[in-house]
């Protein structure tokens, strides 16, 4: 049904949805902070802009009887379910915040007329790119593909000189929502991923694992795998490791990399990290004080969403726009506008685009060091360290089939 | 003694390319911090990019998605890749060090500065 819109005669209202399953364990009273703490930053630059108007959200919490898993996977109803409370109080604003979880967005998304902008702090998963309407402020599985092709098929780098066209991929189906999301889209035999290498295989159990990291006859010497430190370690533990196997750690929204005092463990040795680079000030407001580095991330994609809503707002304001139009809800995206933490680019298809990082561990120091970034935004490699201090043969990574070696020079398709 | 040295300045037509190279000797530039700053004719100095001790690279907005840093720690030096140049990159660049007390921050203060080389950008 046709609901009316909280939108006009200066005042604008964010309908944000407060759902009981969501990508990160989050106490919802964290994002209401989070997003509390950006209406008063939409506020003062509305002001500032000579826009008297006024801007405020409206949380909408799911019936937590119904919907109380806090797990993603069963999450595909409960987004519907909202907008039908929505529906029924003839309660809608401008702009939709939230879900976050990939099912429930997908489900929104195909059953009900998006005429206004959705905003999401997750729906990492493949379903949910090309979305017109459909802004992601978290990086979504399509730009974690986009980098490794990309660096598989880099040789011309002093650490990199072989192109790689192989790869394992360890998922065990126990994941965080985002890995879950990352390792499916890798999976998935149509995506890039898979059309761009030779050989992929998805090792299922710890053991699967464990034979590959000293088996002569594995078919790669590569495998990704998505967590954290201590993910790894539970399953690798102190076990032997050949010496041209490479473990591609994908850890994006985890900061304890960037911590001054923090010492690679032993295991990280043959381990590259892929995160994500940190703002270049430090959170050190309200709503992220007592937050760990990865709900940081997630409260402040919350965050950032009222703030893309308040510069969206500002453009159409000044611009003599009508708020409550098809335009105003496909206009979320190609566009930077300020975020909390300095500037925030959005992709043609309105998902934020970010600089990635990957570390190794010296052996010199056992200090996680910048081996390279990658700007998402210009699908471009950009090496940092040019003499790292690897474990691997001679500083350089190994190419990813053992005993390949004339052939390193030429890219595989 | 501690020493950096810059070099690989010049002219160049606007949208065209420089790679700045600062050569340290007396320290290992490794654990140190490293930023490019620059002068204009008649401006103050103002910070470009800067490599935190650890690796990770901070730009000025100015410069950001044109201006890359590397840094080559068997021969210590570190590189300033400069793309789509514009007239108002002209100015002298300097590169300057600090002994890190972060290894993820930029230092509020460089202790080590090297004599600049200077950049023209003009058709």
């Known amino acids: 049904s046709q609901v009316s819109q909280n939108c006009h005669n200066g005042s604008y209202e964010i309908s944000v949805l407060m759902m009981g399953n969501s990508a990160f364990a989050e106490p919802l009273k964290n994002l209401e902070d989070a997003v509390n703490e950006g209406l008063e930053i939409v506020r003062g630059r509305l002001q500032n802009a000579g826009l008297n108007v006024t801007v405020n959200a409206t949380f909408m919490y799911s019936d937590g009887l119904i919907h109380n898993s806090g797990d993603c996977r069963s999450s595909t109803c409960e987004g519907l379910d909202l907008l039908r409370k929505i529906s029924n109080a003839q309660r809608m604003g401008c702009v939709l915040i939230g879900p976050s979880c990939t099912y429930s967005t997908f489900q929104m998304y195909l059953d009900t007329e998006l005429s206004y902008p959705m905003i999401s702090a997750g729906s990492f998963g493949l379903s949910c790119d090309y979305k017109e309407t459909l802004t992601r402020l978290m990086s979504p599985a399509r730009k974690l593909m986009y980098f490794l092709v990309n660096f598989w098929k880099t040789n011309d780098l002093p650490f990199k000189t072989y192109s790689w066209s192989t790869s394992y991929v360890y998922k065990n189906g126990t994941e965080t929502e985002d890995c879950f999301w990352y390792l499916n889209a890798l999976e998935a035999s149509v995506s890039y991923f898979s059309h761009e290498l030779g050989f992929k295989v998805v090792l299922r159990q710890d053991k699967e694992f464990q034979d590959i990291l000293m088996d002569h006859n594995r078919k790669s010497n590569v495998i990704i795998m998505c967590g954290g430190p201590e993910f790894l370690y539970k399953l690798k533990g102190d076990r032997a490791v050949a010496e041209d196997i490479v473990i591609i750690l994908v850890d994006l929204f985890n900061d304890q990399y960037f911590e001054d005092n923090v010492t690679a463990p032993d295991y990280m040795k043959n381990v590259l990290v892929l995160t994500l680079s940190p703002g270049n000030s430090l959170l050190n407001s309200s709503f992220s004080r007592n937050l760990s580095p990865t709900k940081r991330d997630f409260a402040l994609a919350y965050l950032n969403g009222i703030l893309l809503f308040g510069h969206m707002l500002k453009i159409f304001l000044e611009n003599g726009e009508n708020i409550t139009t098809p335009k105003f809800a496909h206009a979320f995206r190609n566009l930077t506008f300020e975020g909390y933490d300095g500037p925030v680019t959005l992709d043609d298809w309105g998902d934020v685009d970010s600089t990635m990082v990957l570390l190794y561990t010296s052996v010199d120091t056992k200090k996680y060091k910048v081996l390279l970034t990658y700007d998402t935004h210009v699908n471009k490699t950009y090496p940092v360290d040019m003499s790292p201090t690897f474990t691997w043969k001679n500083s350089k990574l190994p190419n990813d089939i053992t005993g390949r070696g004339p052939q390193h020079h030429h890219h595989h398709h | 003694e501690v020493q950096l040295v810059e070099s690989g300045g010049g002219l160049v037509q606007p949208g065209g390319s420089l790679r700045l190279s600062c050569a340290a000797s007396g320290f290992t530039l490794d654990d140190y911090a490293i930023g490019w700053f620059r002068q204009a004719p008649g401006k103050e100095r103002e910070g470009v990019i800067c490599?935190?001790?650890?690796?990770?690279?901070k730009y000025a907005d100015s410069v950001k998605g044109r201006f890359t840093i590397s840094r080559d720690n068997a021969k210590n030096t570190l590189y300033l890749q400069m793309n789509s140049l514009r007239a108002e990159d002209t100015a002298v660049y300097y590169c300057a060090a600090s002994g890190a007390t972060s290894r993820w921050n930029c230092p509020p203060q460089y202790d080590h500065w090297g004599q600049g080389t200077m950049v023209t950008v003009s058709s």
């Open positions: 490599l935190t001790s650890g690796g990770l690279p």
